[in-house]
């Protein structure tokens, strides 16, 4: 005759408060004759959870019809789960005896634990912007999950990062846990449009991880390059000088013109354009009056970007006698 096996397939069952838990138990033989009972815990203090023959178990129902002659499925459902229901559940076969049934074999047990989903990961970047080629730190936090086992990954534009440190607290037993991870990211000049992603995988999420994102645009400062040029064309007695401020981020920019060290207050024409990589270009035109009595003029384009120290470029204006005499356009 085949030896009876008590099969409880799940070692761990995660449930959420208020839901129904299904505890599986099947037997491999109908012999010996006798009932199958469910208990929580072991030892003299173990608690009877279900006995088909006697007792009142309002929250427990059976998955199969236990009165059927050849039934081998003794799985049960426990409704309205509360934190008090956690523990290890055993299905136990008893052999019919007199005056009392005698315990024959126990299943290996299924641990019922409260599963709690992690909160949506929150990613925080550095407090101040940093320039390319430097390293910045991002933190990712998620709270309230259980059990403690959790996986956290970092990505930059879809590429997995390896330079990060993760802690799960508390270290001991707890109702819920928190995870905090800090990733170190080297900024590239084109990172204005980049994203870092913190991805959290947990057993309660059924393979659908949670993600938190941060835009590197919040962390990066791309300083501008400046170029001041004198236009070859002239209109009447005015020369057009251009200051090109290229590839900067963020947009915050102050530009001032100085003529021989004196700040010019008059209006100048300018345009702002956005590059494909998210950086900006700013072009400012400055018209200088040319007259016979003028000495050489030194023009300065000064740019203050995102509250940083001002940078400037100078241009010594080249005005020839020919230019002074002629109204026609000429190349200096």
């Amino acid at each position: 005759e085949e030896e009876l096996q008590m099969i409880q397939p799940e070692k761990l069952l995660l449930v959420t408060v208020g839901k129904t838990a299904t505890l599986h138990c099947t037997v491999t033989s109908l012999l010996p004759v006798g009932p199958v009972l469910w208990f929580r815990g072991v030892g003299p203090g173990r608690e009877l959870i279900y006995n088909q023959k006697e007792g009142h178990f309002p929250r427990v129902t059976t998955v199969s019809d236990l009165t059927k002659r050849n039934n081998m499925d003794f799985s049960i459902r426990i409704s309205s789960i509360t934190p008090a229901d956690v523990g290890t559940y055993y299905c136990v076969k008893f052999r019919k005896g007199s005056p009392e049934n005698v315990e024959f074999k126990s299943g290996p047990g299924t641990e019922m634990a409260l599963g709690a989903k992690p909160s949506a990961p929150v990613v925080l970047g550095p407090a101040a912007r940093t320039t390319p080629e430097h390293t910045v730190s991002f933190t990712c936090e998620s709270h309230g999950f259980s059990p403690r086992d959790i996986t956290l990954k970092w990505f930059k534009n879809g590429n997995e990062l390896s330079d990060f440190q993760t802690n799960v607290d508390p270290t001991g037993q707890s109702v819920a846990y928190s995870i905090r991870s800090t990733a170190r990211v080297v900024l590239d000049p084109w990172d204005v449009r980049s994203q870092v992603i913190c991805e959290v995988a947990h057993v309660t999420l059924q393979g659908d991880p949670l993600r938190g994102t941060a835009n590197l645009s919040e962390a990066i400062r791309v300083p501008p390059t400046l170029e001041v040029t004198q236009q070859p064309m002239r209109v009447g007695n005015q020369v057009n000088v251009t200051c090109q401020v290229r590839k900067f981020y963020p947009q915050s920019l102050q530009l001032t013109w100085s003529e021989n060290g004196n700040v010019c207050q008059r209006e100048t024409a300018s345009t702002l354009t956005e590059n494909k990589d998210g950086t900006y270009n700013w072009t400012s035109w400055f018209l200088v009056n040319i007259s016979d009595q003028r000495d050489d003029v030194v023009l300065t384009c000064q740019v203050k970007h995102d509250g940083q120290l001002a940078v400037s470029k100078r241009l010594a204006l080249e005005v020839t006698v020919h230019q002074k005499d002629q109204s026609s356009d000429a190349t200096p």
Epitope: P44, G45, R46, E47, P99
Partner: antibody, heavy 122, light 107 residues
Framework: EVQLVQSGAEVVKPGASVKLSCKAS????????MHWVKQAPGQGLEWIGA????????TYNQKFKGKATLTVDKSASTAYMELSSLRSEDTAVYYC???????????????WGQGTLVTVSS | DIQMTQSPSSLSASVGDRVTITCRAS??????LNWLQQKPGKAPKRLIY???SLDSGVPSRFSGSGSGTEFTLTISSLQPEDFATYYC?????????FGGGTKVEIK
């Protein structure tokens, strides 16, 4: 009628061992956990541990681990407790009592043996 | 381990007196508490199980109440045969623990 009958009084020398017995009658021996309780002269009660005859599963009070060893003989419906390396502080009355195979409130410690006095003396 | 603190450790009373003994558990044990009576040279005898359920043959002058961590045994009218030592016992969690006992003596 359920009865738990314990072996007679023992006088033993320090360092020796002694094995006490508790024979159950009147119900299915294997359906119950057999517990052992110590009561030193003029003192209160202390739970030592328990054994489940079905599979000889044991549970001990940490304080008595290494001091007490619980065994059963199912065929004789008898539980045993061996006390080792005896010292004067082990002088006490030792009781057996029982509880049901799960924690049915009505079946905890309702039946008790009459007790066995163990005197440790040189 | 769960500690059971019983008070008083002894009391003197007269026949007909109302006697109250309390037991405090160091953590919640629900209602899993027994009250035992022990007379000199005899094995303990259970009077009450599950905090308030009277064992068969136990006089109705004995009653138990409480839950969680605070429990009380009351003898409504003390009789000569009630002079004994009383113990509370928790069976909620292993190791199972007893109170220190209350000796009820004749005044």
């Amino acid at each position: 009628e359920v009865q738990l009958v314990q072996s007679g009084a023992e006088v033993v020398k320090p360092g020796a061992s002694v094995k006490l017995s508790c024979k159950a009658s009147g119900s299915t021996f294997t359906s119950y956990w057999m517990h052992w309780v110590k009561q030193a002269p003029g003192q209160g009660l202390e739970w030592i541990g328990a054994i489940y005859p079905v599979n000889s599963d044991t549970t001990y009070n940490q304080k008595f681990k290494g001091k007490a060893t619980l065994t059963v003989d199912k065929s004789a419906s008898t539980a045993y407790m061996e006390l080792s390396s005896l010292r004067s502080e082990d002088t006490a009355v030792y009781y057996c009592t029982r509880s049901f195979y799960y924690s049915l409130d009505a079946a905890w410690f309702v039946y008790w043996g009459q007790g066995t006095l163990v005197t440790v003396s040189s | 381990d769960i500690q059971m603190t019983q008070s008083p450790s002894s009391l003197s009373a007269s026949v007909g007196d109302r006697v109250t003994i309390t037991c405090r558990a160091s953590q919640d044990i629900g209602s899993r508490l027994n009250w035992l009576q022990q007379k000199p040279g005899k094995a303990p005898k259970r009077l009450i199980y599950a905090t308030s359920s009277l064992d068969s043959g136990v006089p109705s002058r004995f009653s138990g109440s409480g839950s969680g961590t605070e429990f009380t045994l009351t003898i409504s009218s003390l009789q000569p045969e009630d002079f004994a030592t009383y113990y509370c016992l928790q069976y909620a969690s292993s190791p199972f623990t007893f109170g220190g006992g209350t000796k009820v003596e004749i005044k």
